[in-house]
């Protein structure tokens, strides 16, 4: 038979009471029933009491009395009584409800949002409710769009309902903004604020925040966190599909994070306890917002027990090169759960050995590789809780590009010069891993290039490989190799001995291994000039004579040879170029520049310098010669000739020493006849001495010497007496 509706003690659809009063409401029905109450009433424990009793004829009816002490404005709402366990089809007929207004002059609105506006999501064209319901149906409420617009209810598009608020039947973008419900009670203005947001269906991003694929041990708990990011005005529905969905294995928790001022973040967390093999497979998080849809999935693997397998990724012996920015030493590891990883180098923890060693997953990263990084590397893998341990060792060889020791230590900016004809020893000491081989090459200088560096004009010429029997360039005495320990390292020293230095060129030693090649150029310039630079003065001239200077430089080391005169003017040394220079003469090993100044005067005295530019350093080198031109002076005799007697057949010397500038020329006379050198009569150095061998009677007479130069002459005479008898008759 049809149940009669439950009956409420207060009749009608609504009832008004004052705040602070007690609400008594009885429900009488033909079956057991329950109350449905406003949210704020349901939360009351102290004020609310519900008592059940049997009532009516013969106690056959069910009664329930609701008592709400000191009712408050926010208890306003629907109070309904409905039968328990009634088929769905009859639900409408088995419920009685009344809307109770709990009037409070100090609180016209049931929900007050004065400090922080309530956010209402709207969709254009749909109904929008501004839920500023009131505590009394008699309150007049105005709806404003802040600050200047009033939205006036017209009974059609905008309707006022004191139980719901303002109902806007088809909202437009014009309703987006700060909407305020205003009510004036007893001269007081009350406001409750709402922010309307246009609802969109944009899903920015969906992610499962767990590594992919997910790996778990059987019996453990699976937690998958799905995150959907949307604009502030979007709402989403999030669902999961998973292997054992039919048994509802999973529990799902949802939450929303609205703390971000630019986006909403929705979370859906799926949890399955005690994972079994049937739970392995694809887990999909589906996110829907209106017509928009996005999904993301992840694979879940279940393992029965912990395991580790480790293999060499390539071979057991690995090679790298010193100087590499970064080298990754890695092993092929399969393991679950993730093992603890420790790398050892030669038995000691690698990362403790050097800050250049970094562990990344199952790899060891070596930063800025050096040859000290060579050694045995062991990966230790451990899953301690399951007592599973594995290790594997690899050997790392660090190859080093050859380096030539002499190249590093040489501080000479320009090449050495080798004396012509000398024996020379050239050495190259190389280091590298593997041990480099050293080869020698000869590169001749092109003699046409007198103005250029030999090693600059080498492009087109060939280099010749050398051995001890080579006949290219200079004669080679030997080429030998030996090991030498330098700075604690085994280095290969190769020595080339040049037997006879004759030809200028470049000796090149090349050190090679599989990493690379390095070369050292030894400029081998022959010099026939001491130190490669020499200035020569023929003789210091006197006024009126010629000044003759020559400058010889090594042609491979110097260029731009010129003579200059240095003069000091106001404490500053001035360089004057000399116009009287001849062309430089280029020879096999050197360049000579002669300077001749004819008929010099005293003013030609000064510091003469030969200037040349070092081809290698660009530096200008000067070699100076101080020249003092002497004043002319008439000859004068240091001692006059004096008469003397000499024994026949003996010898005699007559001295005529004269000074003067230029040095006087001495002329001898006997009895006014000029004496010429002939057998038995010898004129000494500069004719200053007259030496007569085996004096005869004919040699007796007046001897006369005359010293002459441009300034004049001086004379002296003496009588030579020959004493004794001639042997001539005897000889005849």
């Amino acid at each position: 038979s049809k149940l009669k509706d439950p009956e409420l003690s207060l009749k009608g659809t609504q009832h008004i009471m004052q705040a602070g009063q007690t609400l008594h409401l009885q429900c009488r029905g033909e079956a057991a029933h329950k109350w449905s109450l406003p949210e704020m009433v349901s939360k009351e424990s102290e004020r609310l009491s519900i008592t059940k009793s049997a009532c009516g004829r013969n106690g056959k009816q069910f009664c329930s009395t609701l008592t709400l002490n000191t009712a408050q404005a926010n208890h306003t709402g629907f109070y309904s009584c409905k039968y328990l366990a009634v088929p769905t089809s009859k639900k409408k007929e088995t419920e009685s409800a009344i809307y109770i207004f709990i009037s409070d002059t100090g609180r016209p609105f049931v929900e007050m949002y004065s400090e922080i506006p309530e956010i209402i999501h709207m969709t254009e064209g749909r109904e929008l409710v501004i839920p500023c319901r009131v505590t009394s149906p008699n309150i007049t409420v105005t709806l404003k769009k802040f600050p200047l617009d009033t939205l006036i209810p017209d009974g059609k598009r905008i309707i006022w309902d004191s139980r719901k608020g303002f109902i806007i039947s088809n909202a437009t973008y014009k309703e987006i903004g700060l909407l305020t419900c205003e009510a004036t009670v007893n001269g007081h203005l009350y406001k409750t604020n709402y922010l309307t947001h246009r609802q969109t269906n944009t899903i920015i991003d969906v992610q499962i925040s767990t590594p992919r694929p997910v790996k778990l041990l059987r019996g453990h708990t699976l937690v998958l966190n799905c995150t959907a990011t949307t604009p502030l005005n979007t709402r989403v529905q999030m669902t999961w599909s998973y292997p054992d969905e039919k048994n509802k294995r999973a529990s799902v928790r949802r939450r929303i994070d609205q703390s971000n001022s630019h986006a909403n973040i929705f979370y859906s967390v799926l949890t399955i306890d005690k994972m079994q093999n049937k739970d392995k497979g694809l887990y999909t998080c589906r996110v829907r917002s209106g017509p928009s849809f996005k999904s993301v999935n992840t694979s879940v693997h279940i393992y029965d027990k912990a395991f580790i397998t480790v293999k060499h990724r390539k071979q057991q012996v690995l090679e790298t090169v010193a100087g590499k920015r970064s080298y990754r030493l890695s092993m092929k590891v399969k393991a679950f759960p993730s093992p603890e990883v420790v790398w050892l180098k030669d038995g000691l923890p690698a990362t403790e050995k050097s800050a250049r060693y970094l562990t990344r997953g199952y790899s060891l990263i070596i930063k800025d590789v050096t040859e000290e990084d060579a050694g045995n590397y062991t990966i230790l893998l451990s899953i301690k809780q399951s007592n599973v341990f594995k290790n594997l060792t690899a050997t790392l060889i660090v190859n080093v590009k050859p380096q030539i020791y002499e190249k590093a230590v040489s501080s000479f900016p320009d090449p050495a010069l080798y004396p012509l004809g000398s024996r020379q020893i050239l050495t190259c000491t190389a280091y590298g891993i593997p041990q480099p081989t050293i080869k020698w090459f000869w590169h001749p200088c092109n003699h046409n290039h007198s103005e250029a560096r030999c090693d600059f004009c080498s492009n087109n010429e060939e280099s010749f490989i050398l051995d001890a029997d080579s006949n290219m360039g200079n004669r080679i005495e030997s080429i030998t190799q030996r090991m030498a320990i330098i700075e604690g390292k085994n280095k290969m020293a190769s020595t080339l001995v040049v037997a006879d230095s004759r030809i200028s060129g470049i000796y090149i030693c090349i050190a090679s291994n599989k990493v690379g090649t390095v070369g050292r150029n030894i400029s081998f310039y022959i010099t026939d000039v001491p130190n490669g630079f020499h200035v020569n003065l023929e003789k210091m001239p006197t006024e009126g004579e010629d000044l003759k200077l020559s400058c010889t430089v090594n042609k491979f080391l110097y260029r731009d040879v010129t003579w200059i005169l240095l003069r000091t003017v106001n404490n500053r040394t001035m360089h004057y170029s000399i116009s009287k220079q001849k062309m430089a003469i280029t020879k096999e090993h050197s360049i000579t520049l002669n300077l001749t100044i004819m008929n010099v005067s005293l003013q030609d005295s000064g510091t003469y310098a030969c200037r040349a530019r070092n081809v290698y350093t660009g530096e200008e080198i000067l070699q100076k010669k101080e020249i003092t031109i002497r004043d002319q002076e008439a000859p004068y005799l240091l001692r006059n000739l004096s008469d003397h007697t000499v024994a026949i057949s003996s010898s005699t010397t007559l001295d005529c020493h004269a000074n003067g500038v230029p040095e006087p020329q001495i002329t001898w006379f006997k009895n006014n006849h000029k004496i010429q050198q002939e057998p038995g009569i010898i004129l000494g150095p500069g004719s200053s001495t007259l030496f007569i061998e085996r004096v005869t009677e004919e040699d007796e007479g007046v001897y006369h010497c005359k010293a002459t130069n441009q300034k004049g002459s001086v004379e002296s005479s003496a009588y030579l007496t020959v004493q004794g008898t001639s042997d001539k008759s005897n000889l005849e």
């Epitope: 004065s114 600050p147 617009d149 014009k174 203005l189 604020n193």
Partner: antibody, heavy 119, light 110 residues
Framework: EVQLLESGGGSVQPGGSLRLSCTAS????????MNWVRQAPGKGLDWVSS?????????YHVDSVKGRFTISRDNSKNTLYLQMNSLRAEDTAIYYC???????????WGQGTTVTVSS | QSVLTQPPSASGTPGQRVTISCSGS????????VNWYQQIPGTAPKLLIY???QRPSGVPDRFSGSKSGTSASLAISGLQSDDEADYYC???????????FGGGTKLTVL
């Protein structure tokens, strides 16, 4: 780009009149309430007038300008106006045209136009 | 005399936190929301905070606003030299039916 451009400022004698204009661009002019705010030399900001979206019901003025100033708008021209009559020396200021934010406050300001009232 | 009351000046050193207060009455701050504006000398004001505490996009999170009863305050943390400006609070006033502003606070970064 949302922009407000004021014009019509200038010098006028006390008792004179001026009409300020503000041309809006970069947004749907008719959907927003608009305001005039002024700033006397070396002083703070003072609200002058406001007008609602449609420009029919709600116009508001500060007491000191009531009966002298009138705010109006022409939505078809995207222009806001301030008709200023019976000007006084104390009306000397930079006048800013401002747009109401969707939710609260004035989110866009013009660069201002200067009004000088002196004899 | 401004309807809302602000201190005429405030100062702080770079990196410091500075707070500017604004007090009003029930008809303005008490019953309405507060906005804050920044005005760099020679330029138009700029909206800094709306709805008591919301920042428009582009305003750094160093700026924060709050309201309690009939008072509001603006806090600037990690003070920078380019924060030197005049700061104004504003609210709607139900009695005057219009906007009211504070007198402005000149912030100096020492």
């Amino acid at each position: 780009e949302v922009q407000l451009l004021e014009s019509g400022g200038g010098s006028v004698q006390p008792g004179g009149s001026l009409r300020l204009s503000c041309t809006a661009s970069g947004f749907n002019f008719e959907d927003y309430g608009m305001n005039w705010v002024r700033q006397a030399p070396g002083k703070g900001l003072d609200w002058v007038s406001s007008i609602n979206r449609q420009g029919d019901i709600s116009t508001y003025h500060v007491d000191s300008v009531k009966g002298r100033f009138t705010i109006s708008r022409d939505n078809s021209k995207n222009t806001l106006y301030l008709q200023m009559n019976s000007l006084r020396a104390e009306d000397t200021a930079i006048y800013y045209c401002t747009k109401n934010h969707d939710y609260h406050g004035m989110d866009v300001w013009g660069q201002g136009t200067t009004v000088t009232v002196s004899s | 005399q401004s309807v809302l009351t602000q201190p005429p000046s405030a100062s702080g050193t770079p990196g410091q936190r500075v707070t500017i207060s604004c007090s009003g009455s029930r008809s303005n701050i008490g019953n309405n929301f507060v906005n804050w504006y920044q005005q760099i000398p020679g330029t138009a004001p700029k909206l800094l905070i709306y709805l008591n505490s919301q920042r428009p996009s582009g305003v750094p999170d160093r700026f924060s606003g709050s309201k309690s009863g009939t008072s509001a305050s603006l806090a600037i943390s990690g003070l920078q030299s380019d924060d030197e400006a005049d700061y104004y609070c504003a609210s709607w006033d139900d009695s005057l039916n219009g906007w009211v502003f504070g007198g402005g606070t000149k912030l100096t970064v020492l």
